[in-house]
Amino acid sequence: ASNFDCCLGYTDRILHPKFIVGFTRQLANEGCDINAIIFHTKKKLSVCANPKQTWVKYIVRLLSKKVKNM
């Protein structure tokens, strides 16, 4: 659910880390209405996810670790 590159809501699905190549943080105080994590998938889709949810934090942590180890 995004409009002009802003997420307007969150996915109600859970994604596997193997499906995700990267993410972008959306901050509510930078021109968008809500905080969000935008996951970029291997199918070239952008998925808006709730940064408070455990599965989202888990994937963000995994991807951040990967970047650190590069």
Epitope: H16, K18, F19, K42, K52, Q53, T54, W55
Partner: antibody, heavy 120, light 107 residues
Framework: QVQLVQSGAEVKKPGASVKVSCKAS????????MHWVRQAPGQGLEWMGV????????TYNQKFKGKATLTVDTSTSTAYMELSSLRSEDTAVYYC?????????????WGQGTLVTVSS | DIQMTQSPSSLSASVGDRVTITCGAS??????LNWYQRKPGKAPKLLIY???NLADGVPSRFSGSGSGRDYTLTISSLQPEDFATYYC?????????FGQGTKLEIK
């Protein structure tokens, strides 16, 4: 050791509701998801939905939206699955199963199953 | 939703045989696949996670392989306790979906 102990078999009339419990022990309840899976007679396994006990976030298989409600009581490390407006096709064995994203999102421990029979 | 198709749906084999069960996804699931064993009257048991990784306590005669849309469970030398029904499961994205099962019977 990890254990998931489910409530006993239930026989219900069509239109009634049933609430199945799943008591977890041997691990930190809030660190793992709890999935619910069913197997109807002569059928395969069917994923119903999942709850994250740390924040009660749920997501459901579309087929079970409005039919199943997943909840948890973290004080007793118990997960619940309530089925409403029961019909004969809801007759099945219902399993709770721990979701472990440390092992590739697999369901690594299962309850013994609860048979729900819907019959008039 | 992602569809999972197993073959064969049933299979007769003898103790000591090498057995292969295949699972096909309706789209690429990038190795997000698990295998379970279910015996009558018992809860399913995790065998393989992440397409290739053996779960704790599972004998090494079980192995998993595959990528993309096509996956395989192999039992290198069947033992009497292996006669059961086997299910593959997609965990790429909810709703998680299972194959219809492969029933392994004694010949």
């Amino acid at each position: 050791q990890v254990q998931l102990v489910q409530s006993g078999a239930e026989v219900k009339k069509p239109g009634a509701s049933v609430k199945v419990s799943c008591k977890a022990s041997g691990y930190t309840f809030t660190n793992y998801w709890m999935h619910w899976v069913r197997q109807a007679p002569g059928q395969g396994l069917e994923w119903m939905g999942v709850i994250d006990p740390s924040d009660s976030y749920t997501t459901y298989n579309q087929k079970f939206k409005g039919k199943a409600t997943l909840t948890v009581d973290t004080s007793t490390s118990t997960a619940y699955m309530e089925l409403s407006s029961l019909r004969s096709e809801d007759t099945a064995v219902y399993y709770c199963t721990r979701g472990n994203y440390g092992v590739d999102y697999a369901m690594d421990y299962w309850g013994q199953g609860t048979l729900v029979t819907v019959s008039s | 939703d992602i569809q999972m198709t197993q073959s064969p749906s049933s299979l007769s084999a003898s103790v000591g045989d090498r057995v292969t069960i295949t699972c096909g996804a309706s789209e690429n699931i990038y190795g997000a696949l698990n295998w379970y064993q279910r015996k009558p009257g018992k809860a399913p048991k995790l065998l393989i996670y992440g397409a290739t990784n053996l779960a704790d306590g599972v004998p090494s005669r079980f192995s998993g392989s595959g990528s993309g849309r096509d996956y395989t469970l192999t039992i290198s030398s069947l033992q009497p306790e292996d006669f059961a029904t086997y299910y593959c499961q997609n965990v790429l994205i909810t709703p998680y979906t299972f194959g219809q099962g492969t029933k392994l019977e004694i010949k």
